[in-house]
Interface confidence: low
């Protein structure tokens, strides 16, 4: 939350390093040196050697049976009058060699050399953190603010503790960041400046340096743990989980040391672990800023027809709209393109078939014709006509098409099976002629368009991956009878003795990321948060908990009234909407401190110039910040207005909502994401909309657009009655 | 093929016990997180619990813990639901069920489950 323009703030995590700091448990990722296998901590490069030109470097040699030997050692020290950073594994003389020196040091030459292997402690290599940083071993030495780092043997300007001789194997040379004893903050030294005694530096996240495109079938980058933080096995081991992934039988898919890859087809890039109840998992790979297709704009994959501009055709058509048959995708003869199975791996390109890989109006190919570089495959039929209908108009409650499948992929099941369920939240006679056998439909008039009902317990229903016709304009949101509705119910706010107590913030909630607060959310009902779906970056529910009745995000102060909750589902938005329903695995006891707060009524609008309110714990600016629940005052605006302090580039459409702040500078910001925008009717307060990431945190003069809430209403009430909660 | 088959089920008095299994069949079956949901008469599917692939994790729904217990042997490909302090509202058909993702950690409510058993029908009465 944004109070005023100020300075970057992660110190505020109050990093207490040397001060009272208790031993830390360490994370599986980071840790558990034991009598272990280590070589899964070093990069290996085959048939390499290094050969130093500087004859002051050392060198320790040993016989020993294996590469596994050379690294338990390396790692530990033991017996090295040095540090080991890497070593080379003589497969002919069944030697070691450490090294005090890597690859890229001075004095050093790398080798060609077909009985040795080079490998290289990564965290020697390395010039990101994973978790909290404790293992690196880089050489960043200037903090976050731009302070360049005090000698870790030096006592000026500042003295300590923290002498390497104290900390053997924390490396704590030179003036390089360091995080010893694995604090909050990550790396951090002390600083060159006498007023500053310490400060973490801005060293980033291996998760966040790595990314991949589409599914990661070609990523190749170094992740080597996985989304929970367990180390990754490495490819060329067989323990502790046997596969059939071999290094050598596939020596196309990447698999170098224990990286994350994706050889199989899966969703995205995974790995075995070392973790021995746990065979596999998948890694935190972001998506790249240019990824060629992204997770929320997978096309609708189809073989008879054309959906849209046909980057989901998937069907055998080889010749463009002449006749001309098409070149194959993997060849270059008679054109030379790099439109090649391999550069694009998730776009289909078999044979010579018709695709669409680079978002082309419709699919093309290459043709054999050496004359005719291209041409597109224009006479394949589009969907709209073959099939009827492939896309729905206004809600789609007349949509008569033949999809059977839900947006995650789970076959719907009959609509007779389902009518009682149906009539559960219906108050009228659904036209049973139009529901017909599985297919998708929308018998409730449902705003956001056809669904149907699943098998599955926990996801009873679901909305179908249909989209609305093209220059379709019917507003789904049509209320005749009452142009203008209004967002408030007719009910009071509470008040105890005439004195609005904590209630009004009790329906705030902070959503923890693996113990740390991570965003806004708001309590609608005893079991269900309303948050954003830019708030969950791990698939495991088990990362998350909701803290409820308190007001400092670290819960100091809050212990009588504080509620700690897991999570037990998502329910994701309909498409676009960035809306997350979240139960909660049991419900919340409402009390002085913990409340709900209203809905809108659906479709309802509020008045230009409303004042309402924004709630966060998110990045304040502030560099002592005091980790108390702040507010900034807003007011509605229209949404043509908006778009106007927006510079035109912005188009605001029906489930949007706009307001800009009193106070220059003030608005929601990173943290407060999932928070609530309240506002007030009729002297009741109700959660107006929902903080999505925006353009840039409180840039004056720019409005915040927030999801509407009020557009999403009736979903919300839906989920509520159809997804139960089991009752205690 | 995949197959899930249930059996176990019966009539028992409140209070009373049983045991339900699942054969699993058609798939490598520790891969795979699995789970029982239930359905009572005339109401829609309820999930009552889940077990990851190598029953390091275990979920129940609110009203069952305690009572109920989820287990699995990998070496059988057979899945076990415990249910003690049995009452008139656990009548129900019993469906056991194979997680969509094979991921351990995907265990739980927040799973999909792609292939469901016949059921086996438990009734609670005295």
């Known amino acids: 939350m944004w109070v005023t323009k100020l300075l970057p703030a992660l110190l505020l995590q109050h990093v207490l390093l040397h001060l009272l700091l208790l031993p830390i448990a360490i994370p599986y990722a980071e840790g558990q040196r034991k009598r272990r296998n280590t070589i899964h901590e070093f990069k290996k490069s085959a048939k390499t050697t290094l050969i130093k030109i500087d004859p002051a470097l050392k060198i320790k040699t040993k016989k020993v049976n294996t590469a596994d030997q050379c690294a338990n050692r390396c790692t530990r020290n033991k017996g090295l009058p040095f540090t080991c950073k890497a070593f080379v594994f003589d497969k002919a003389r069944k030697q070691c060699l450490w090294f005090p020196f890597n690859s890229m040091s001075s004095g050093v030459k790398k080798e060609f050399g077909h009985e040795f292997d080079l490998y290289e402690n990564k965290d020697y290599i390395r010039n990101c953190i994973i978790g909290k940083g404790r293992s690196y071993k880089g050489t960043v030495s200037i903090t976050k603010s731009g302070i360049k780092c005090q000698p870790w043997s030096s006592m000026i300007p500042h003295e300590h503790s923290f002498l390497p001789s104290s900390y053997r194997g924390k490396d704590l040379q030179e003036n390089y960041c360091r995080n010893p004893r694995g604090e909050e903050g990550g790396p951090w030294c002390f600083t060159s400046n006498p007023e500053v005694r310490y400060e973490v530096c801005d060293i980033p996240q291996c998760s966040e340096v790595e990314c991949m495109t589409c599914n990661g079938e070609s990523y190749r980058g170094l992740m080597d743990h996985t989304e929970s933080g367990k180390i990754c096995q490495r490819w060329d081991h067989q323990t502790p989980h046997r596969h059939k992934f071999l290094p050598e039988r596939y020596p196309d898919k990447g698999f170098d040391d224990n990286y994350c890859r994706n050889p199989d087809g899966q969703p995205r890039p995974w790995c075995y672990t070392l973790d021995p109840h746990t065979r596999w998992e998948y890694c935190a790979i972001k998506t790249c800023a240019d990824n060629t297709m992204n997770d929320t704009d997978v096309p609708l994959e189809t073989t008879e027809c054309i959906q849209g501009q046909g980057e989901g055709y998937r069907g055998t058509v080889n010749t463009i709209w002449n006749g001309i048959p098409c070149q194959r995708w993997d060849s270059q003869y008679p054109h030379e393109h790099d439109m090649t199975p391999e550069n694009f791996k998730c776009k289909d390109l078999r044979e010579n078939y018709c695709r669409n890989p680079d978002g082309s109006e419709s699919p093309w190919c290459f043709t054999t014709d050496p004359n005719i570089r291209v041409g597109y495959c224009s006479q394949i039929p589009n969907c709209d006509m073959s099939h009827g209908q492939d896309c729905y108009r206004g809600n789609g409650k007349n949509y008569m098409g033949n999809l059977s499948q839900t947006r995650s992929g789970l076959t719907c099941s009959m609509w007779d099976k389902n009518m009682e369920d149906l009539h559960r939240h219906i108050f009228w006679e659904p036209d049973a002629s139009k529901l017909n056998e599985n297919y998708c439909r929308n018998p409730d008039d449902d705003a956001h368009g056809p669904w149907c009902y699943t098998g599955n317990p926990l996801i009873p229903w679901d909305y179908c991956p249909i989209s609305r016709c093209e220059g379709d304009t019917t507003p789904t949101i049509v209320n005749l009878d009452h142009p203008v509705i209004s967002c408030a119910k007719t009910k009071q706010l509470r008040v105890v003795n005439g004195i609005p107590t904590r209630t009004n913030i009790g329906w705030m909630v902070s959503l923890r990321y693996r113990n740390k607060h991570i965003c806004g959310g708001s309590l609608i009902k005893e079991s269900w948060v309303l948050t954003a779906r830019q708030c969950f970056p791990s698939r495991d529910l088990k990362d998350y908990e909701a803290w409820l009745g308190i007001h400092d995000v670290h819960g100091r102060g809050d212990e009588k009234c504080k509620q700690v909750l897991n999570v037990s589902q998502l329910v994701y938005g309909p498409e676009g909407s960035d809306l997350v329903l979240m139960k909660l695995a049991r419900p919340a006891v409402l009390d002085d401190f913990v409340s709900t707060i209203d809905l809108p009524n659906y479709g309802c609008t509020i008045p230009e110039k409303t004042s309402c309110s924004v709630y966060g714990w998110g990045y304040t600016g502030l560099i002592n910040y005091d980790g108390l629940l702040r507010v900034a005052h807003l007011y509605i605006m229209g949404n043509e207005k908006c778009s106007q302090h927006h510079r035109g580039k912005v188009t605001l459409n029906e489930s949007e909502i706009c307001a800009g702040a009193e106070k220059i500078g003030s608005g929601p910001c990173e943290g407060d994401y999932g928070g609530p925008l309240v506002c007030e009717q009729h002297k009741m307060r109700m959660v107006l909309g929902v903080i999505v990431p925006g353009r840039g945190c409180a840039i004056p003069n720019r409005p915040g657009i927030f999801v509407r809430v009020a557009y999403y209403a009736k979903w919300i009430h839906k989920i509520i009655l159809t997804y139960k909660v089991p009752q205690s | 093929e995949v197959q899930l088959v249930e059996s176990g089920g019966g009539l028992v008095q409140p209070g009373g016990s049983l045991r339900l299994s699942c054969a699993a069949s058609?798939?490598?079956?520790?891969?795979?997180?699995m789970s029982w949901g239930r359905q009572a008469p005339g109401k829609g599917l309820e999930w009552v619990s889940a077990i990851s692939w190598n029953g390091g994790s275990t979920y129940y729904a609110e009203s069952m813990k305690g009572r109920f217990t989820v287990s699995r042997d990998n070496a059988k490909n057979t899945l076990y639901l415990q249910m003690n302090s049995l009452k008139s509202e656990d009548t129900a058909v019993y469906y056991c069920?194979?997680?969509?993702?094979?991921?351990?950690?995907?265990?739980?409510?927040?799973?999909?489950?792609?292939?469901w058993g016949q059921g086996t029908q438990v009734t609670v009465s005295s």
């Open positions: 058609g798939f490598t079956f520790d891969d795979y997180a």
């Open positions: 069920a194979k997680a969509l993702d094979p991921l351990g950690v995907l265990a739980g409510t927040s799973g999909i489950y792609d292939y």
